[in-house]
Structures are given as structure tokens and as C-alpha cells.
Interface confidence: low
């Protein structure tokens, strides 16, 4: 007879994923004799900080660093204590500090710095807090999906690893500040900053990835709003019945607006806004964020980026899933292909504020949004993107995968930790048959 | 430093094709596009076409389709225009020009940043 | 295609003046860039994207605009600054210059 085994060790990583609106902590753990397996890697638990993103303490960095105490404090119970020094742990900041470090980087550094300074009073094993770039949050992003979702290689019953016939998922990321497209392609990349050459567990992926700065939810919301200001004396994209006082500082003070931005204005003056209902004009206004007019490739998408055609099935996750989520629960509507998206987008945006407060009682919050954001989504993906009714098909709008958030985290540890190797492992793995 | 050179000047005759040469020095070729560009006495600046030396992807203004024919040479960093069918409107200086770009807020704006002296093309009988 | 049209066509200043290129467009664009071009000389990038000053342009050159009409200021001109002066768009397709201003110093 032989001895019982214990399981084995587990092995944990943190991240703290420091996006515009919000940070989040993600904690992973794996078993430590399996590290070199696929979907091996799942979530142990997660916090949401509270208040903003890193990015709103620009004047105030040591409070960015205070922000996160109460879920390092959460880190230290859920992490058992014995692993705490061999633990990593990571933060990374995405668009909204991207968009602060063009515009203050002096704050930028400030607040990154605040942040470490708190990071490394605890007793993990920290490594580090940046800005990732736009490819790196959406190449992360896809390597988290495919991950999850073993689409890499797959443990075969008899020990041995193969190459599932399956492809890569695309991935679709909607932040508050920036939103990325990722998918493996055939295409020879046209704009050399587009293309990731991966090489995973022995399989070679060319990946075409683009992130769109300022296109993430909560700045084309405030985009839209100053477009509203310029043109109009109403919100087309908000319901008739609400109304708001807009104080300009908020909507001008983004990089994001600076477009709309009239050459002087109060920042501390209040504007009255109220909404109109209008999907017609709510169209028109979100197809203003889009320019097709150059393209110096032989395609395109938007605003001269290339990009090749949409090619496979694709995940949509963050405030995509978010968005048609909304669609199709609380508002009961169907969006299983383009055009129903599109009459969703304007069933929402035809809603009184009555209405729709009667269709989702408890008064969600961002209720005014939900308009803007479905026409968004609607025209980022057939018009901006190029998604048919066909390509449209393969897409899923899912946040979880494998019981684990979808986003840039896991693979951005993943890559750090070195848990995915380039290399395939040996023929034979773990399966003792003697 | 940056450099772009181009061959010397050509004299040749109505009907007769030129191939004219830019060789890069002092980036990674591959990584930018190559732009060609005429300019005839007295005439203004005209683009012609460009080139991705990574994937040999030519675009060309529908002005010069069948006029000119750009083409690289990878190992050689350099990258050729052939002009054909030569007439004396032809007569030009032709410059290469590097793409330069730069992300601003997501949108990729494009210049050419770095030019070649220019090479004298001369059609005359 | 867009056409650029530059004035004036020549310009005359002297040392130490401020003087103002402008260059329009028949339809909207985005953004341009200026190109300086000295006699004998490929052009050189002067501006890029409408008012950001390329590398190693000194901080006399600025540039503005929007729509269809687009400037080029020199705020002290020097004797080196005798050129032609061209704008160029690239936000339709063909991508086109203008016809260029000839500034000569006195």
C-alpha cells in the first residue's frame, strides 16, 4: 500500500488592478506541482477599493496609496500567513493613469509612488506598480480568456499534451478610459505597433491588438455630455424627465474633451441639462466619436488605426458584458444579432426617465447611461470594428470564465510569474500509471 | 543618425523606365513605411505611394497607378521607385520619405519625418 | 482630393517682423503639418499634427487652425527662415500639399 498524499501546496499571486473608475484586487492561487499547466490558475478571491481610481488623487497622491489599505488588510487574512513572503504582488494601471501621466505626469509619478510607498509595508513579495500600455492591457486580456477557457493546449487523459483543434477567442475589453480589441490573425499587420508575436507553451500566435484611448465608457459618456453642451440645449442620449445640474470643470477637465473644450468657460459654473429621448439625434451624436475619413492602410477601423478583418469567435467582457447585460435582463430585450442590439440601443433610448425607473425599480445607478452606452457598443461593434451579422454570432458577453473575472490581471501575472512557458512541457505529465 | 540617400540624378529618354533607389540607415527599416514623393519644376509636392517594407504592402495615388512601381529590398535596407512609360511631364525630383506617426488619444496621426535629398530625374530625347 | 491653397504665394519680411502663413482647404480636414524647404534642400518637418513643433525646430515657428483654414506664425523672423513653406494634409485620401508660400528676407 502506499501513503496517502496530502494535497498539494498552493501557491497564491495578488494583483491590483488600478483601472480609471475603480482599483480592484484580484487574488490567485494554483497548486504548486502543476504550475506549468493550462487553467491551472484560478481566482482564491477579490476586493473592490473604495472611491476612485488611483487617477482621481492627483491632488492628493497619499491618499492613493491609503485607498488600498482595506484590501491588503482583506490580502493578509484570505492569503494563509506562512505564504505571505512568496507571494507576488503586482499593480497596474491602465487608462486612466495613462491619460494622467500625458496630462500631469508630475502627479502621475506622485501617486505611483504613494502607492508603492503602501505596497511595500506589507509582507508579500512586491514587484512592482506601472502603467501598462494600451497592447499590453489588451494582449493580457486575450491571454486571460484563453487561458481560462484551455484554449492554449489541453492535459489529454493519458498524460500526455495536445494542441486543441478549437482556436483562440478574440477579446473585447471596455474600460472607463480605453477600450482594447485582440485577436489572433493570419493578416500581415500594416502598423508595426499592432502586432504581438506570442509564443505559448511551444505554439506560435500573431495577435492584432489596438487600444483606443478615451473610448472606454466613462469617457465617451463625458465626451458625449460635451458634445451635448456644444450642440445642443438638451441630452439627446438622456431620458425626457431627468435632469441634472453639469459643473463644467468636471466635463472639460478630461484630455478626453478637450476637442469640445470652448477656449474660455467657468469651470465652476453649473449648466442645467435635461434629457430629450431622441435615439435619432443620440445616434448622430455617438457616430461623431468615429472618423472614417482617413485611412492610410489598406483597411481600417476608426480614426486611421489598422486593422484586419474580424476573424473567429470573440469574448466581450468589463462594461460590455455590463452594457448588453442591462439589455437583456433588466430590460428584458433580445441581442443575439446586430440588429437587435440596435433596436435595443434605441428601445432604451426612446425610455421617459419614468420608464425606465418603472422597468428597473431601485433606481440603478448610471440608469441616464444606459442610452449612450447600448448606441456605443451598438456602433463600436458593426461600424467601428466591422462586426457583420455573421462575425457578430461568435461574439459572448461574459465577465467570468472558469469562475474567474475576465481582464488583463490573470495574464499580466501569468507573463510576470512566468506560469505560461514558451516552451510545450514534456510528453508525460504527472499521470503515474506504474 | 536617421539618414536616407538616395541614387543620382538620370537623364533619360521618352518611353525608357528609371528605377531610383533610397537606402535607410540608422533604424530598423522594417518598422516604418516608405513614401515617395514628386516634385516638378515649379509644381507642387504630389505623393505618389507608400511602401510596408514588412509585408511589401504598396498603396499608390491613383494619379501614378501604372506610372510608378515601388518595390524594397529588405536585406538591403532600401527601398525603389521604378517610374515607366516616361514623358517629359515626368521630369521631377523625386524624394523617399520615412512615415513617421505618433498615438495622440487613439488616433494614429502620420508625417514623414525624415527625407532623402532627392534624385533628378531628367526625360529628354 | 483636397486641395491646399497657400497665401500669399510670396512673402517679403524682415528680420525681428512676426508674420502669419495661412493655408486653406476646399473640404474639413483634421490636422495638417508644415514642411520648410530651403533652395537645393528635400523638405524638412517644420510642424506636425497642426501646432506640435517637430524636433529641433526652434520656438519661433507655431502653428494653429481648424476646419478648412489652417496658420503658420513666425513671432521673430530670422535670416535663415528664407524658404518655401508647405502645408500638407493627411486626412484624405490622396494625401495632397499646398502650393507653397516663398518667404524672402529683406
Known amino acids: 500500500t502506499r501513503d496517502i498524499r496530502e494535497p498539494p501546496a498552493l501557491k497564491y499571486g495578488i494583483v491590483l488592478d488600478a483601472g480609471s473608475s475603480h482599483t480592484s484586487m484580484f487574488i490567485y492561487k494554483w497548486p504548486a506541482d502543476k504550475e506549468n499547466d493550462t487553467g491551472i490558475v484560478g481566482q482564491h478571491s477579490s476586493c473592490d477599493v473604495p472611491g476612485g481610481g488611483i487617477s482621481s488623487y492627483a491632488d492628493n497622491p497619499s491618499g492613493a496609496g491609503q485607498s488600498l489599505v482595506g484590501c491588503l488588510e482583506q490580502a493578509l487574512r484570505d492569503v494563509p500567513k506562512e505564504r505571505h513572503a512568496g507571494t507576488p504582488l503586482y499593480l497596474g494601471a491602465t487608462a486612466g493613469m495613462r491619460l494622467l501621466n500625458l496630462t500631469n505626469p508630475e502627479a502621475s509619478t506622485s501617486v505611483l509612488t504613494a502607492v508603492t510607498h503602501t505596497l511595500t509595508q506589507y509582507p508579500f513579495d512586491f514587484r512592482g506598480a506601472r502603467i501598462l500600455s494600451g497592447q499590453e492591457e489588451g494582449v493580457f486580456g486575450w491571454v486571460t480568456a484563453n487561458y481560462l477557457l484551455e484554449n492554449f493546449i489541453k492535459y489529454g487523459w493519458v498524460g500526455r499534451w495536445f494542441r486543441p483543434r478549437k482556436g483562440t477567442l478574440g477579446a473585447m475589453d471596455l474600460g472607463g478610459a480605453s477600450t482594447q480589441i485582440t485577436f489572433e490573425t493570419t493578416s500581415p499587420a500594416e502598423d508595426r505597433a499592432s502586432e504581438v508575436q506570442l509564443r505559448l507553451y511551444g505554439q506560435h500566435y500573431r495577435v492584432y491588438t489596438h487600444s483606443f484611448l478615451c473610448y472606454g465608457r466613462d469617457q465617451v459618456l463625458q465626451r458625449l455630455l460635451a458634445s451635448a453642451l456644444q450642440t445642443h440645449s438638451f441630452h439627446p442620449c438622456w431620458p425626457r424627465g431627468f435632469s441634472t445640474h453639469v459643473l463644467l470643470g468636471d466635463v472639460y477637465q478630461s484630455p478626453c474633451t478637450v476637442a469640445q473644450r470652448p477656449q474660455t468657460f467657468n469651470s465652476s459654473a453649473r449648466v442645467s441639462l435635461s434629457g430629450s429621448s431622441d435615439p435619432h439625434l443620440c445616434r448622430d451624436l455617438v457616430s461623431g466619436l468615429f472618423s472614417f475619413s482617413s485611412c492610410p492602410f489598406s483597411r481600417c477601423s476608426f480614426n486611421g488605426v489598422f486593422q484586419p478583418p474580424v476573424a473567429g469567435n470573440f469574448i466581450a467582457f468589463s462594461a460590455f458584458f455590463y452594457t448588453v447585460n442591462f439589455l437583456r435582463t433588466s430590460m428584458g430585450l433580445p441581442v443575439a444579432t446586430l440588429q437587435q442590439l440596435e433596436a435595443a440601443a434605441v428601445n432604451v433610448c426612446n425610455q421617459t426617465w419614468a420608464q425606465l425607473q418603472a422597468r428597473v425599480p431601485g433606481q440603478q445607478a448610471h440608469l441616464a447611461d444606459y442610452c449612450a452606452g447600448a448606441m456605443f457598443v451598438q456602433q463600436l461593434l458593426s461600424r467601428g470594428y466591422g462586426f457583420d451579422e455573421r462575425a457578430f454570432g461568435g461574439v459572448i458577453f461574459q465577465k467570468k470564465a472558469a469562475d474567474t473575472a475576465v481582464g488583463w490581471a490573470l495574464g499580466y501575472m501569468l507573463n510576470l510569474t512566468n506560469l505560461i512557458p514558451a516552451d510545450p512541457p514534456g510528453l508525460r505529465k504527472g499521470t503515474d500509471f506504474s | 543618425q536617421v539618414q536616407l540617400v538616395q541614387s543620382g540624378a538620370e537623364v533619360v529618354k521618352p518611353g525608357a523606365s528609371v528605377k531610383i533607389s533610397c537606402k535607410a540607415s540608422?533604424?530598423?527599416?522594417?518598422?516604418?513605411?516608405m513614401d515617395w514623393v514628386k516634385q516638378a519644376p515649379g509644381q507642387r509636392l504630389e505623393w505618389i505611394g507608400d511602401?510596408?517594407?514588412?509585408?511589401?504592402?504598396?498603396t499608390y495615388n491613383q494619379q501614378f497607378k501604372g506610372k510608378a512601381t515601388i518595390t524594397v529590398d529588405k536585406s538591403a535596407s532600401t527601398a525603389y521607385m521604378e517610374l515607366s512609360s516616361l514623358r517629359s511631364e515626368d521630369t521631377a525630383v523625386y524624394y523617399c520619405?520615412?512615415?513617421?506617426?505618433?498615438?495622440?488619444?487613439?488616433?494614429?496621426?502620420?508625417?514623414?519625418?525624415?527625407w532623402g535629398q532627392g534624385t533628378l530625374v531628367t526625360v529628354s530625347s | 482630393e483636397i486641395v491646399l491653397t497657400q497665401s500669399p504665394a510670396t512673402l517679403s519680411a524682415s528680420p525681428g517682423e512676426r508674420i502669419t502663413l495661412s493655408c486653406s482647404a476646399s473640404s474639413s480636414v483634421s490636422y495638417i503639418h508644415w514642411y520648410q524647404q530651403k533652395p537645393g534642400q528635400a523638405p524638412r518637418l517644420l510642424i506636425y499634427s497642426t501646432s506640435n513643433l517637430a524636433s529641433g525646430i526652434p520656438a519661433r515657428f507655431s502653428g494653429s487652425g481648424s476646419g478648412t483654414f489652417y496658420t503658420l506664425t513666425i513671432s521673430s523672423v530670422e535670416p535663415e527662415d528664407a524658404a518655401v513653406y508647405y502645408c500638407?494634409?493627411?486626412?484624405?485620401?490622396?494625401?495632397?500639399f499646398g502650393g507653397g508660400t516663398k518667404l524672402e528676407i529683406k
Open positions: 511602401i510596408n517594407p514588412k509585408y511589401d504592402i504598396s
Open positions: 540608422g533604424y530598423t527599416f522594417t518598422d516604418y513605411n
Open positions: 520619405a520615412r512615415r513617421g506617426f505618433f498615438l495622440y488619444y487613439g488616433i494614429n496621426y502620420y508625417y514623414f519625418d525624415v
Open positions: 500638407h494634409q493627411w486626412s484624405s485620401y490622396p494625401w495632397t
